[in-house]
């Protein structure tokens, strides 16, 4: 039973590699998936000596480890690329690193933008 689920229909979109991949750089993404499957938003980023470099944001297909996550929180200690996923429209706007071994929680706030809608 999926009791606490927040339906995800739209996510913040970003692609640092947009020129090479011939996509938009940023905006909103409408999520599409198979019937009866849940959808999520995600964010991925690098942290080079405290400087945050966004990699990608967007929709994420049904993934059980994303269920019931209202906030986008990465917990891996020191990966090459940080990853988080969540449920609920635009839940990937803000993202957080909360390392498993303790340490400080770091939340990344997006700069204000006027996003374009991607379909």
């Amino acid at each position: 039973s999926g009791r606490g689920e927040a339906e995800t229909r739209e996510c913040i979109y970003y692609n640092a590699n947009w020129e090479l991949e011939r996509t938009n750089q940023s905006g909103l993404e409408r999520c599409e998936g198979e019937q009866d499957k849940r959808l999520h938003c995600y964010a991925s980023w690098r942290n080079s000596s405290g400087t945050i470099e966004l990699v990608k944001k967007g929709c994420w297909l049904d993934d059980f480890n994303c269920y019931d996550r209202q906030e986008c929180v990465a917990t891996e200690e020191n990966p090459q690329v940080y990853f988080c996923c969540c449920e609920g429209n635009f839940c990937n706007e803000r993202f957080t690193h909360l390392p498993e071994a303790g340490g400080p929680e770091v939340t990344y706030e997006p700069p204000p933008t006027a996003p374009t809608l991607l379909t």
């Epitope: 999926g2 606490g4 499957k37 849940r38 993934d63 019931d68 498993e100």
Partner: antibody, heavy 118, light 110 residues
Framework: EVQLLESGGGLVQPGGSLRLSCAAS????????MSWVRQAPGKGLEWVSA????????YYTDSVKGRFTVSRDNSRNTLYLQMNSLRAEDTAVYYC???????????WGQGTLVTVSS | QTVVTQEPSFSVSPGGTVTLTCGFN?????????PSWYQQTPGQAPRTLIY???TRSSGVPDRFSGSILGNKAALTITGAQADDESDYYC??????????FGGGTKLTVL
Amino acid sequence: EVQLLESGGGLVQPGGSLRLSCAASGFTFRNSAMSWVRQAPGKGLEWVSAISVTGGSTYYTDSVKGRFTVSRDNSRNTLYLQMNSLRAEDTAVYYCAKVYYYSFFDYWGQGTLVTVSS
Amino acid sequence: QTVVTQEPSFSVSPGGTVTLTCGFNSGSVSTSYYPSWYQQTPGQAPRTLIYNTNTRSSGVPDRFSGSILGNKAALTITGAQADDESDYYCVLYMGSGIHVFGGGTKLTVL
């Protein structure tokens, strides 16, 4: 180091109940979805149940629906499987497993044996 | 009811290459099912080999690789060794919380 330690297995009569526990350490339990997988003697692995990070979403294989209940206590870093109306065909080693992104089992416990017999 | 199928048994010579497959009865396996592979020796807990179709788990030698072959997920072992003799299981994630194991393949190295 990630550790998953199951307990609570044993011999029980058909129709009886057992509660399995899985004590987790070495990772942030409240941030991980979890699952139970079982293996009958001489048989293959079978997924039994899964529970989301908050416990708000729970899922079961058809053969245990209505008889088994999965739950978690994030303050105690413990996963549970309450098994009621047990049948001979529930006899198996029960493993708890941590579920990671891409919905795979990245860590496994050593298992606890449940024997249902009269 | 989804049934995930694997070859019941397979033999490979030491140093040889073997490909185990994983399909299901309701269509083609794709990356959206996040195919994963596990190795199990008798009396031991399973060990994670491959996840997300083709990503090796930490500490798994690069002799093990995963892919999609046609309409199935595949696990390839190149340069098979005696201690690769084990049972191998694939898992497909069907969505909505449901994971389905294949019946397993008993691999013999001889």
